[in-house]
Amino acid sequence: RQQWELQGDRRCQSQLERANLRPCEQHLMQKIQRDEDSYGRDPYSPSQDPYSPSPYDRRGAGSSQHQERCCNELNEFENNQRCMCEALQQIMENQSDRLQGRQQEQQFKRELRNLPQQCGLRAPQRCDLEVESGGRDRY
């Protein structure tokens, strides 16, 4: 069993290395920014990311592309729930520095949890999305 878990971890690691999670990150950022735009946030505020949604994209145009590609990538993890969780954790880690404030972080986390279902995939049952400097409970 230990050997199997080790192989599983290695397989998951190589799957994660070949996955492109950027479309998922962009899709989620678009979603939470669209929500904020409707509450009066300045849609033209500058961003560090060359592919962050333009004000035009944020109103919905272009977002289906990020979602489609994102779902394709997550689909690769469909038969490995633990690995799917690690993919979601990686998305959270990658974007944590760009999230402004606790509210935006919670919103991002909520959307992230819904992401597999949005793609028609099974969501991992237990998946800790807390970003900490220390170790993380992995199931």
Epitope: R18, Q26, Y51, S63, Q65, H66, E68, R69, N72, E78
Partner: antibody, heavy 123, light 108 residues
């Protein structure tokens, strides 16, 4: 050397079938999404089909949907295109192309192409 | 289906001149999913630009891509003899992953 080599093209009658193959070498085939793109004589490029790394997501152009089937065998480093109910308008050079992405920013692109194999549908 | 329309169909210029090729999408395309390819007669396409503006490895800096939303541009600042070819834009965000019909860049 990173390489893609297509084979299986030829002359076939309308309504007939053909199976194209693409042999990959010089890279870890199972790490990449793959595509078929075709080009009719004197015409532009037309995307035909794509398949993800573990074959979990497959897409087709409307013009070939229901007639063509893309598949891959990661153990054999090979990509396939089964073409049934062939029509005159399927006459083209068929290219196999590897899809990669920019690790830091995310955009996808087809960076490695085969030389193509010619399919001629004619009675 | 996202339809990409390239213009002009043919562009006749001389070496040393600047070439501006346009690609217009029927609906918005995220920059992340806009690619440019070059194809010479009898050869397979060659990747030029991805993510709308990032040059692929080994592509000279005279090639540049720009644009967003529905309007994208490929610019070749000073044409070299080897640049005369057909150029295609492609979107790979929404299936089907469509190509434009191409712009033929020919020597004047």
């Amino acid at each position: 050397e990173v390489q893609l080599v297509e084979s299986g093209g030829g002359l076939v009658q309308p309504g007939g079938s053909l199976r194209l193959s693409c042999a990959a070498s010089g890279f870890i085939f199972s790490d990449y999404n793959m595509n078929w793109v075709r080009q009719a004589p004197g015409k532009g490029l037309e995307w035909v089909s794509s398949i993800t790394r573990s074959s979990r997501t497959i897409y087709y152009a409307d013009s070939v949907k229901g007639r063509f089937t893309i598949s891959r065998d990661n153990a054999k480093n090979s990509l396939y295109l089964q073409m049934n109910s062939l029509r005159d308008e399927d006459t083209a050079v068929y290219y196999c192309a590897r899809e990669d992405f920019d690790v830091s920013t995310g955009p996808y692109y087809m960076d490695v192409w085969g030389k193509g194999t010619t399919v001629t549908v004619s009675s | 289906e996202i339809v990409l329309t390239q213009s002009p169909g043919t562009l006749s210029l001389s070496p040393g001149e600047r070439a501006t090729l346009s690609c217009r999408a029927s609906q918005s395309v995220s920059n992340m999913f806009l690619v440019w390819y070059q194809q010479k007669p009898g050869q397979a396409p060659r990747l030029l630009i991805y993510g709308a503006s990032t040059r692929a490895t080994g592509i000279p800096d005279r090639f540049s891509g720009s644009g967003s939303g529905t309007d994208f541009t490929l610019t070749i600042s000073r044409l070299e003899p080897e640049d005369f070819a057909v150029y295609y834009c492609q979107q790979n965000g929404n299936s089907p992953y469509t190509f434009g019909q191409g712009t033929k860049l020919e020597i004047k």
